[in-house]
């Protein structure tokens, strides 16, 4: 549109003036006036602002509390917040990753479909026919039943989703 119908993209309106916003990593010290420019100052150590802004205070970097199982995945800068993740064997309870919980294990009869990461829990799946899991584990997939035939053996006891088949020698005595 012409002429402009608002201040420009990186400006804000104050006292009839379109003043420049402060760029990411800087906070507002004073608004522009007829006589002066917008005054901005860089955020201090352990502070950040991630957008063009008119904030008078920078935000504190997130603290990755080890007591909650957290550790730093990416150190914050003046323009970005710190990114936390969880210690090995743990995962975040939310997208914001404010605390961690132990990865769940898949019970006997269930295998791991997807191994947990720092931000997602273990995904389990029931062992289908022909597969079993006899342990509680956060890593083990369902294992296929042993094939007795390939060992020249016969099934003595059928497998379940929690147990393998039991193979035995073929009965040579025929009536």
């Amino acid at each position: 549109p012409e002429p402009p119908t608002a201040c420009r993209e990186k400006q804000y309106l104050i006292n009839s003036q379109c003043c420049s916003l402060c760029q990411p990593g800087q906070k507002l010290v004073s608004d522009c006036t007829e006589f002066t420019e917008t005054e901005c100052l860089p955020c201090g150590e352990s502070e950040f602002l991630d957008t063009w802004n008119r904030e008078t205070h920078c935000h504190q970097h997130k603290y990755c509390d080890p007591n909650l199982g957290l550790r730093v995945q990416q150190k914050g800068t003046s323009e970005t917040d710190t990114i936390c993740t969880c210690e090995e064997g743990w995962h975040c309870t939310s997208e914001a990753c404010e605390s961690c919980v132990l990865h769940r294990s898949c019970s006997p009869g269930f295998g791991v479909k997807q191994i947990a990461t720092g931000v997602s829990d273990t995904i389990c799946e029931p062992c289908p026919v022909g597969f079993f899991s006899n342990v509680s584990s956060a890593f083990e997939k369902c294992h296929p039943w042993t094939s007795c035939e390939t060992k020249d053996l016969v099934v003595q006891q059928a497998g379940t989703n929690k147990t393998d088949v039991v193979c035995g020698p073929q009965d040579r005595l025929r009536a």
Epitope: T5, A6, E9, L13, C18, S20, L21
Partner: antibody
Framework: QVQLVQSGAEVKKPGASVKVSCKAS????????MYWVRQAPGQGLEWMGW????????TYAQKFQGRVTMTRDTSISTAYMELSRLRSDDTAVYYC??????????????????WGQGTLVTVSS | DIQLTQSPSFLSASVGDRVTITCRAS??????LAWYQQKPGKAPKLLIY???TLQSGVPSRFSGSGSGTEFTLTISSLQPEDFATYYC?????????FGQGTKVEIK
């Protein structure tokens, strides 16, 4: 204090191109649109277009479409105006100017509050 | 394009004189008009924007008025440093055109 410092005078042959720079200081470069205006010897002022230094998007006066390219480098707070296929009637002083916007009576009023010192471009064979 | 016609093109005046320059637009531009002063070899300097608002640092002897198609720049008491060329500019419609200029000379 706000300053717009332009590159030095240029002498070019017809058909050549010229690139003029405009280095800004004393304010947040990406916060204000930058305009280019030229003035032929002894003549009036002619508006060429503008660039949004934040996005890099330019708008050109129809007269210069296809011959002018306005760019910027935010890392060094510098705007550029390149004019190609130069003719003798492109001989002029080229100015960069910063846009200011004033709000009053429900309207937004632009004007050019700071200007570069000008760059003389002479096109001669 | 919107044409701006300044009158007069030349003006001879003495220090202390009241000077008025007119700028006429070929179509209505509301108050989207600015006035600039330019001295030889120098860049233009903003005097007035929004037709009548004085730019900071500009002496109060300069004033602007008008709306629509007719605008005036007035210097209430001409000073030696005011001898220069004055341009109006419309900012209502692209391209943002300038008037041809009014040169104020010493009588």
């Amino acid at each position: 204090q706000v300053q717009l410092v332009q590159s030095g005078a240029e002498v070019k042959k017809p058909g050549a191109s010229v690139k003029v720079s405009c280095k800004a200081s004393g304010y947040t470069f990406a916060g204000y649109y930058m305009y280019w205006v030229r003035q032929a010897p002894g003549q009036g002022l002619e508006w060429m277009g503008w660039i949004n230094p934040d996005s890099g998007a330019p708008t050109y006066a129809q007269k210069f479409q296809g011959r002018v390219t306005m760019t910027r480098d935010t890392s060094i707070s510098t705007a550029y105006m390149e004019l190609s296929r130069l003719r003798s009637d492109d001989t002029a002083v080229y100015y960069c100017a910063r846009e200011k916007i004033y709000y009053g009576s429900g309207n937004y009023y632009p004007s050019f509050d700071y200007w570069g010192q000008g760059t003389l471009v002479t096109v001669s064979s | 394009d919107i044409q701006l016609t300044q009158s007069p093109s030349f003006l001879s005046a003495s220090v202390g004189d009241r000077v008025t320059i007119t700028c006429r637009a070929s179509q209505g531009i509301s108050s989207y008009l600015a006035w600039y002063q330019q001295k030889p070899g120098k860049a233009p300097k903003l005097l007035i924007y929004a037709a009548s608002t004085l730019q900071s640092g500009v002496p109060s002897r300069f004033s602007g008025s008008g709306s629509g198609t007719e605008f005036t720049l007035t210097i209430s008491s001409l000073q030696p440093e005011d001898f220069a060329t004055y341009y109006c500019q419309q900012l209502a419609s692209y391209p943002w055109t300038f008037g041809q200029g009014t040169k104020v000379e010493i009588k």
